[in-house]
Amino acid sequence: KSEMPQPVSIQDINHRVWVLQDQILIAVPRKDRVSPVTISLISCRHVETLEKDRGNPIYLGLNGLNLCLMCAKAGDQPTLQLKEKDIMDLYNQPEPVKSFLFYHSQSGRNSTFESVAFPGWFIAVSSEGGCPLILTQELGKANTTDFGLTMLF
C-alpha cells in the first residue's frame, strides 16, 4: 500500500514558525496574523538502501502547494531550495531522490533534518528572526538546527 504524507507544524526552540514569502521559507515569531505553512512529510520507501542509524529518511513538502524542499549546490556550497514537485511523485520513484531527502532525527522533543545528498548539512534558521531557512554545517552556533514537530489532524 502507498503511504500518505503526514501534515505537521514546525517551530524552532525560539517559537518561530515557518512561513512562505515570495517562494522562500522564512522563520518568524509566531504572532496573531502570521499564517505558518503546514509541512507534509513522508518516509522514503527505499529506506533499506540508505544509511542506517542516521535518522528516518523523509521527503518534506509544503502541504497543498506542490512545493518540496531540496538541496542543491550553488557554487561550492549546498543550498536549501523550494522546487515545484509533488511529494508523492518523489515517494513513488524507483530510487531515493537524494536531493529531496532529509534524515529526520529526534532527541526528546527536538528534531533535526540532515541533507541526505550533503551529509553533515542541516536545515537551520539564523538566530535572528525573519531570515530564510538555510543549510548549515555549524550546529548550535549562530544557527538553530533543532525544531519541534507537532502532528496535525
Partner: antibody, heavy 121, light 109 residues
Framework: EVQLQQSGAELVKPGASVKLSCTAS????????MYWVKQRPEQGLEWIGR????????RYDPKFQGKATLTADTSSNTAFLQLSSLTSEDTAVYYC??????????????WGRGTTLTVSS | QAVVTQESALTTSPGETVTLTCRSS?????????ANWVQEKPDHLFTGLIG???NRAPGVPARFSGSLIGDKAALTITGAQTEDEAIYFC?????????FGGGTKLTVL
C-alpha cells in the same frame, strides 16, 4: 564531458572470479547511482544490480545474488563488478551505466562501451 | 520473475511515425513501472531516451516520446530518421528490481 571507461576484455577459466571496472569522468559517482547490465548474444539485456557509491548500498536482481558483487571506490571515481564461480553462462558483454534523476525522473543517461567476458577452458 | 516482451523487429520509412511497445507478463503496465527506453546502436553505443514512462532524457530529440497505450508502455518516434535505425530496449520496474525486454530491432529504409 561525461564518460564511463570500462576495463578491457577478459578471458578466464571456469570456476574463477573476475573483477570488472568502470571509471567515470566528468561527474562524481557519489552523486548518482551506478547500474550494471549483462548482454549475451541474441539475448537482450539483463539487469544485474546497482550501487549507491556514496554509501555503498547495493541492490541485486535475485538471479545475480551470490554471483555478482558490486563495489565502488569514490577516491578513484570507479565502480566495480565482481563475478564469481564463472561458467560459460557468464560469457557476455557487461555494461555500467549512470542512472540519474533529472527534473522529474530517473534516466539511464550515460553508458560505458562494455567489457567482453569470455569464460572458457 | 516478470517477463517483459517487445516486438522483435519493426520496419519504417523516413518521415513516418512508428510505435514500439513493451508488455508485462504480470498484467497492465502502469506509471508505477516507471518504464525506461534505451537505444543501442552498433559498436555497443547505448543512449537513454525515456525515463518514468514519458519523460525524455536531457538532450534527446523531441521526436521520441514515451506513453502508455492500452496495457503496454510505448515509445513513439514521430518522423523517423535514418539515424534512428537501432535496437530499442524497454525496462520496467517491479518493486525493487528492474527487468529489461528483449529489444526491438528498428529498420528505417
Amino acid at each position: 564531458e561525461v564518460q564511463l571507461q570500462q576495463s578491457g576484455a577478459e578471458l578466464v577459466k571456469p570456476g574463477a572470479s573476475v573483477k570488472l571496472s568502470c571509471t567515470a569522468s566528468g561527474f562524481n559517482i557519489k552523486d548518482t547511482y551506478m547500474y550494471w547490465v549483462k548482454q549475451r548474444p541474441e539475448q537482450g539485456l539483463e539487469w544485474i544490480g546497482r550501487i549507491d557509491p556514496a554509501i555503498g548500498t547495493t541492490r541485486y536482481d535475485p538471479k545475480f545474488q551470490g554471483k555478482a558483487t558490486l563495489t565502488a571506490d569514490t577516491s578513484s571515481n570507479t565502480a566495480f563488478l565482481q563475478l564469481s564461480s564463472l561458467t560459460s553462462e557468464d560469457t557476455a558483454v557487461y555494461y555500467c551505466a549512470r542512472y540519474d534523476y533529472s527534473g522529474s525522473s530517473f534516466y539511464f543517461d550515460y553508458w560505458g562501451r562494455g567489457t567482453t567476458l569470455t569464460v572458457s577452458s | 520473475q516478470a517477463v517483459v516482451t517487445q516486438e522483435s523487429a519493426l520496419t519504417t520509412s523516413p518521415g513516418e511515425t512508428v510505435t514500439l511497445t513493451c508488455r508485462s507478463s504480470t498484467g497492465a503496465v502502469t506509471t508505477s513501472n516507471y518504464a525506461n527506453w534505451v537505444q543501442e546502436k552498433p559498436d555497443h553505443l547505448f543512449t537513454g531516451l525515456i525515463g518514468g514512462t514519458n519523460n525524455r532524457a536531457p538532450g534527446v530529440p523531441a521526436r521520441f516520446s514515451g506513453s502508455l497505450i492500452g496495457d503496454k508502455a510505448a515509445l513513439t518516434i514521430t518522423g523517423a530518421q535514418t539515424e534512428d535505425e537501432a535496437i530499442y530496449f524497454c525496462a520496467l520496474w517491479y518493486s525493487n528490481h528492474l527487468v529489461f525486454g528483449g529489444g526491438t530491432k528498428l529498420t528505417v529504409l
